[in-house]
């Protein structure tokens, strides 16, 4: 009974450094508490971008200083990452854990490659 997690293969961040994607999981059980973590993989290094635990039917709440925001609807989480710059280009992996009730399930997506292009500075006007 593995849990499958789906996410888009590629997303292009906006010129304001904002990227959004959907993380969808096929729940093997009736979870009431879910944890979603976004991991960034670049050059074989893995770092946690953000994480949130939420109760099904409630809003997804990240920490105040998080660069992530999100909403949940059923087995679908809409994630937005802001403040991105070109150096943040990389593979962003959605990790979903069904925390409660037992049994626990882990699901890891294949990752979304987020491309970030820094905007060209506006040329000085004469």
């Amino acid at each position: 009974k593995a849990m499958h997690v789906a996410q888009p293969a590629v997303v292009l961040a906006s010129s304001r450094g904002i990227a959004s994607f959907v993380c969808e999981y096929a729940s093997p059980g009736k979870a009431t508490e879910v944890r979603v973590t976004v991991l960034r993989q670049a050059d074989s290094q893995v770092t946690e971008v953000c994480a949130a635990t939420y109760m099904m039917g409630n809003e997804l709440t990240f920490l105040d200083d998080s660069i992530c925001t999100g909403t949940s609807s059923g087995n679908q989480v809409n994630l937005t990452i802001q403040g991105l710059r070109a150096m943040d280009t990389g593979l962003y992996i959605c990790k979903v854990e069904l925390m409660y009730p037992p049994p626990y399930y882990l699901g890891i997506g294949n990752g979304t490659q987020i491309y970030v292009i820094d905007p060209e500075p506006c040329p000085d006007s004469d």
Epitope: M3, E48, Y105, L106
Partner: antibody
Framework: QVQLVESGGGVVQPGRSLRLSCAAS????????MHWVRQAPGKGLEWVAV????????YYADSVKGRFTISRDNSKNTLYLQMNSLRAEDTAVYYC???????????WGQGTMVTVSS | EIVLTQSPGTLSLSPGERATLSCRAS???????LAWYQQKPGQAPRLLIY???SRATGIPDRFSGSGSGTDFTLTISRLEPEDFAVYYC?????????FGQGTKVEIK
């Protein structure tokens, strides 16, 4: 560097209690699920318990449910295992382990020996 | 509970030879959630492979993992003296977390 160090093992009589500790360093402790795994002399590995992140969710192996309690103090970067009503079959080396980013147990402590004998 | 059965129980080989260890699950395990560990006498286990085929940090490329569904394999392409140890497979996709009983790789 990333490290886990267990302590608190020893020899105890059946029915008595013991508390194990696991001090973590080198990583953001609160961002990881933490497990206890044990190994009886000459035997294989047996998962014992896990505690998640802020500590509100805990799971136990059937063999220890109702007798063992896992807890954590994120301010002290420390994991605990309170073992009550100990039995001879609880004799083992107890390891704490980190559930890594991908879920596998990527960091292990050196282990602490618990012997339950009269 | 997912039961993992490892075979053989003991593998007697010489340095330089190829070792093939098997792990069979009682029900399907997603390859994303199957790990292999190495344990030497008096030491803690060490993560070798996660996600069935991804090498953990610092693990030499002579170690490789493969498989899906219920059948998984750990291969050591050329045994080095330090590779003689006990190897465990583990599933971590759902609770309870379970290990195989281990395969001992010993010097022939």
């Amino acid at each position: 560097q990333v490290q886990l160090v267990e302590s608190g093992g020893g020899v105890v009589q059946p029915g008595r209690s013991l508390r194990l500790s696991c001090a973590a360093s080198g990583f953001t402790f609160s961002s990881y699920g933490m497990h206890w795994v044990r190994q009886a002399p000459g035997k294989g590995l047996e998962w014992v318990a896990v505690i998640w992140y802020e500590g509100s969710n805990k799971y136990y192996a059937d063999s220890v449910k109702g007798r063992f309690t896992i807890s954590r103090d994120n301010s002290k970067n420390t994991l605990y295992l309170q073992m009550n009503s100990l039995r001879a079959e609880d004799t083992a080396v107890y390891y704490c382990a980190r559930g890594g980013d991908w879920g596998a147990f990527d960091i292990w402590g050196q282990g602490t020996m618990v012997t339950v004998s009269s | 509970e997912i039961v993992l059965t490892q075979s053989p129980g003991t593998l007697s080989l010489s340095p330089g030879e190829r070792a093939t260890l098997s792990c069979r699950a009682s029900q399907s395990v997603s390859s994303s959630y199957l790990a292999w560990y190495q344990q030497k006498p008096g030491q803690a286990p060490r993560l070798l492979i996660y996600g069935a085929s991804s090498r953990a940090t610092g693990i030499p490329d002579r170690f490789s993992g493969s498989g899906s569904g219920t059948d998984f394999t750990l291969t050591i392409s050329r045994l080095e003296p330090e590779d003689f140890a006990v190897y465990y497979c583990q599933q971590y996709g759902s609770s309870p977390w379970t290990f195989g009983q281990g395969t001992k790789v010993e010097i022939k």
